[in-house]
């Protein structure tokens, strides 16, 4: 189970993980105390044939070709959390692990 | 964490789980002894706005809008295994639990 890594200048057409730094301040998300920025990454690219298909199911659906199925797409297949310090809705400061904030691997599903 | 369920004739435009029966015999996959058919389901539909987004990361990437990011797509967010009896590459009969063969829920990621 592997995935491609690319940089922002890559001409790779296939499904790949690209670097992306999310800047909460730039978004105006002022309820986030820390981090102000973090490396989130994202997935982009084509999912042709059986390249990087995470599940056998993806291949089976492609074979069956039901109505309206648009084929597999490039999406996170492994993600990890980050620790964050933030205000909740009651203005309390919370320190917690927020799941699925970083893309570790991309694939076709 | 929920997902929409649709039938195969539905005109629902949003990301939805549709029924799909996979027939291994019809595919010519004769190395599979049992089951010959199973209910696999599949995901189809549009992922607009923040509808059914599984991860906060999906929304963040949409906000950041990096080059080449195609927006979230409708993909399995919960899958389950099935038990299968099949021939392996050495012509041995194997009974095992094959992961991620059934789509239980669809979402946008």
């Amino acid at each position: 189970d592997f995935g491609l890594d690319c940089d922002e200048h890559s001409t790779e057409s296939r499904c790949c993980r690209y670097p992306l730094t999310v800047d909460f301040e730039a978004f105006g998300w002022d309820w986030i105390i820390a981090p102000k920025r973090y490396k989130a990454n994202y997935c982009s690219g084509e999912c042709e044939f059986v390249f990087l298909q995470k599940y056998p199911h993806t291949h089976l659906v492609h074979q069956a070709n039901p109505r309206g199925s648009a084929g597999p797409c490039c999406t996170p297949t492994k993600m990890s959390p980050i620790n964050m310090l933030y205000f909740n809705g009651k203005e309390q400061i919370i320190y917690g692990k927020i799941p699925a904030m970083v893309v570790d691997r991309c694939g076709c599903s | 964490d929920f997902g929409l369920d649709c039938d195969e004739h539905s005109t629902e435009s949003r990301c939805c789980r549709y029924p799909l029966t996979v027939d291994f015999e019809a595919f010519g996959w004769d190395w599979i002894i049992a089951p010959k058919r199973y209910k696999a389901n599949y995901c189809s539909g549009e992922c607009e706005f923040v509808f059914l987004q599984k991860y906060p990361h999906t929304h963040l990437v949409h906000q950041a809008n990096p080059r080449g990011s195609a927006g979230p797509c409708c993909t399995p967010t919960k899958m389950s295994p099935i038990n299968m009896l099949y021939f392996n590459g050495k012509e041995q009969i194997i009974y095992g639990k094959i992961p991620a063969m059934v789509v239980d829920r669809c979402g946008c990621s």
Epitope: A70 | H9, S10, S13
Partner: antibody
Framework: EVQLLESGGGLIQPGGSLRLSCAAS????????MSWVRQAPGKGLEWVST????????FYADSVKGRFTISRDNSKNTLYLQMNSLRAEDTAVYYC???????????????WGQGTMVTVSS | EIVMTQSPATLSVSPGERATLSCRAS??????LAWYQQKPGQAPRLLIY???TRATGFPARFSGSGSGTEFTLTISSLQSEDFAIYYC?????????FGGGTKVEIK
């Protein structure tokens, strides 16, 4: 003003091909599903095909499946219908129609073009 | 496919009178039903969507009702510009299907 303008109709022999175009203006084209609906002379309305806003999903009536292909170019605000293996029964006025997006279902058409006539005859 | 049946095929009404048009679906379409008005030589115009919501540009004398399989379009007091063909259409299931139309003509 929201407008749809079809073109590409004409007289064609059975078995021939034709491509219809529909130029859209006055709305964010890529945000709306688009459809083709036809009307044979003196008859009622018949849905032909629908394509989602992104172009990722397409749907066809059984009567045209495998012969007609719907597509769109969102950069040009244009909808297309490629019609192959044309038959006499395909003779009709072809309307391009915009989805109203009144709920989450495809298929209620709030804006229609003026139509383009396709005649299949030898 | 869902078959949409409209009745009557032709309705002869005097100006100022009430017109009631019926549309029946062969199976439930929930409230995913539209009505269109078509005049000779023109494209159809969306009149009602969601079974009962009037589209922009049509006056309050037009009203739609029903859900499931039985639907009605009512024109409370017919004006000269209302004489046309009216089609119902379901958009609950593929394929999308239209009724055969009701022609509202001057009596």
């Amino acid at each position: 003003e929201v407008q749809l303008l079809e073109s590409g109709g004409g007289l064609i022999q059975p078995g021939g091909s034709l491509r219809l175009s529909c130029a859209a203006s006055g709305f964010t084209f890529s945000s709306f599903a688009m459809s083709w609906v036809r009307q044979a002379p003196g008859k009622g309305l018949e849905w032909v095909s629908t394509i989602s806003g992104s172009g990722g999903y397409t749907f066809y009536a059984d009567s045209v499946k495998g012969r007609f292909t719907i597509s769109r170019d969102n950069s040009k605000n244009t909808l297309y219908l490629q019609m192959n293996s044309l038959r006499a029964e395909d003779t009709a006025v072809y309307y391009c129609a915009k989805d109203g997006r009144y709920n989450w279902n495809y298929g209620a058409f709030d804006i229609w073009g003026q139509g383009t006539m396709v005649t299949v005859s030898s | 496919e869902i078959v949409m049946t409209q009745s009557p095929a032709t309705l002869s009404v005097s100006p100022g009178e009430r017109a009631t048009l019926s549309c029946r679906a062969s199976q439930s379409v929930s409230s995913n039903l539209a009505w269109y008005q078509q005049k000779p030589g023109q494209a159809p115009r969306l009149l009602i969507y969601g079974a009962s919501t009037r589209a922009t540009g049509f006056p309050a004398r037009f009203s739609g009702s029903g859900s499931g399989t039985e639907f009605t379009l009512t024109i409370s007091s017919l004006q000269s510009e209302d004489f046309a063909i009216y089609y119902c259409q379901q958009y609950n299931n593929w394929p999308l299907t239209f009724g055969g139309g009701t022609k509202v003509e001057i009596k």
